[in-house]
Amino acid sequence: KESCDVQLYIKRQSYHSIFAGDPFKLECPVKYCAHRPQVTWCKLNGTTCVKLEGRHTSWKQEKNLSFFILHFEPVLPSDNGSYRCSANFLSAIIESHSTTLYVTDVKSASERPSKDEMASRLWLLYS
């Protein structure tokens, strides 16, 4: 029998390489049974996760999973950093793993970085 606990399926130590000026949707995959939980996004500032207020969010429904989406319209350089979603479920808070947005500011780059440049930058981000 499947558990009816809420699960937030953000992969541990996942990341997204994105460009400033582009639109981007950050998805939090949510598994629940009867009642859809209240889900919020926050951005990590050191060890504190600061709740994101007044941002454009939406839900997307797929067969076995729902997605709580944080919209970046467009991505700004200041959106660089780590994000986490959390759900209120039976008066408990379930937190996801954090996922990191690595934002390249195209204004400061003469061209989009190569695979090797991106790899070395991401290496610094995770080391």
């Epitope: 699960q7 992969k11 996942s14 060890t47 080391s127």
Partner: antibody
């Protein structure tokens, strides 16, 4: 039942490239990570890197950054490891490994391995 | 990179006797989420490795309870309470906290 079926043994010439495949059954690769691990004859295990098949994002051990390229196709539930500029040092068995279940994502199921022999 | 040091290199044990393998990491393996991503693997002769233990001490399904994992921070131990013939092979520890992921050098368990 979870299974990782790897492609057959390869005999390749120095300087050439080779692509190995790993086809998953019993789970969707997009829901986890796929790791690749190298084992030289009579030696230990070396982590090459990982791919997130959901978005194609990769992480490599710096030692393999210029040697290996990881890709994945969700449609066929298959991951690939390409090795380039092969030398005798690349003669080894290469394993694909499932990156584990939510929430821990630590390697659990292993493929049977693909033997690569580099020889002229 | 995090260096994983396993001792001993080889362990020769009589069937029915206990065995203990040590794995020390050069950095703390406690992750920011409060979990310690240390696993133990066994590679039997001619086979792929198989996971025995994850998160330091959690036993995989189907793994006999004569195997126990313990430790924290940088010091970890795999113990077999009573060695059986099917336990022979090479044991590896692996850390999944830091990039790049790294393995210990392996400990060969031989049956006396």
């Amino acid at each position: 039942e979870v299974q990782l079926q790897q492609s057959g043994a390869e005999l390749v010439k120095p300087g050439a490239s080779v692509e190995l495949s790993c086809t998953a059954s019993g789970f969707n690769i997009k829901d986890t990570y796929i790791y690749w691990v190298k084992q030289r004859p009579e030696q230990g295990l070396q982590w090459i890197g990982r791919i997130d098949p959901a978005n194609g994002h990769t992480k490599y051990d710096p030692r393999f950054q210029d040697k290996a390229t990881l890709t994945a196709e969700i449609s066929s539930n298959t991951a690939h490891l390409q090795l380039n500029s092969l030398t005798s040092e690349d003669t080894a068995v290469y394993f694909c490994v499932r990156g584990g279940d939510h929430p821990y994502y630590v390697m659990d199921w292993w493929g049977q391995g693909t033997s690569v022999t580099v020889s002229s | 990179a995090v260096v994983m040091t396993q001792t001993p290199l080889t362990l020769s044990v009589t069937i029915g006797q206990p065995a203990s393998i040590s794995c020390k990491s050069s950095q703390n393996l406690l992750d920011s989420d409060g979990k310690t991503y240390l696993i133990w693997l066994l590679q039997r002769p001619g086979q792929s490795p198989m996971r025995l233990i994850y998160l330091v001490s959690k036993l995989d399904s189907g793994v006999p309870d004569r195997f126990t994992g313990s430790g924290s921070g940088t010091d970890f131990t795999l113990k077999i309470s009573r060695v059986e013939a099917e336990d022979l092979g090479i044991y590896y520890c692996w850390q999944g906290t830091h990039f790049p992921r790294t393995f210990g050098g392996g400990t060969k368990l031989e049956i006396k």
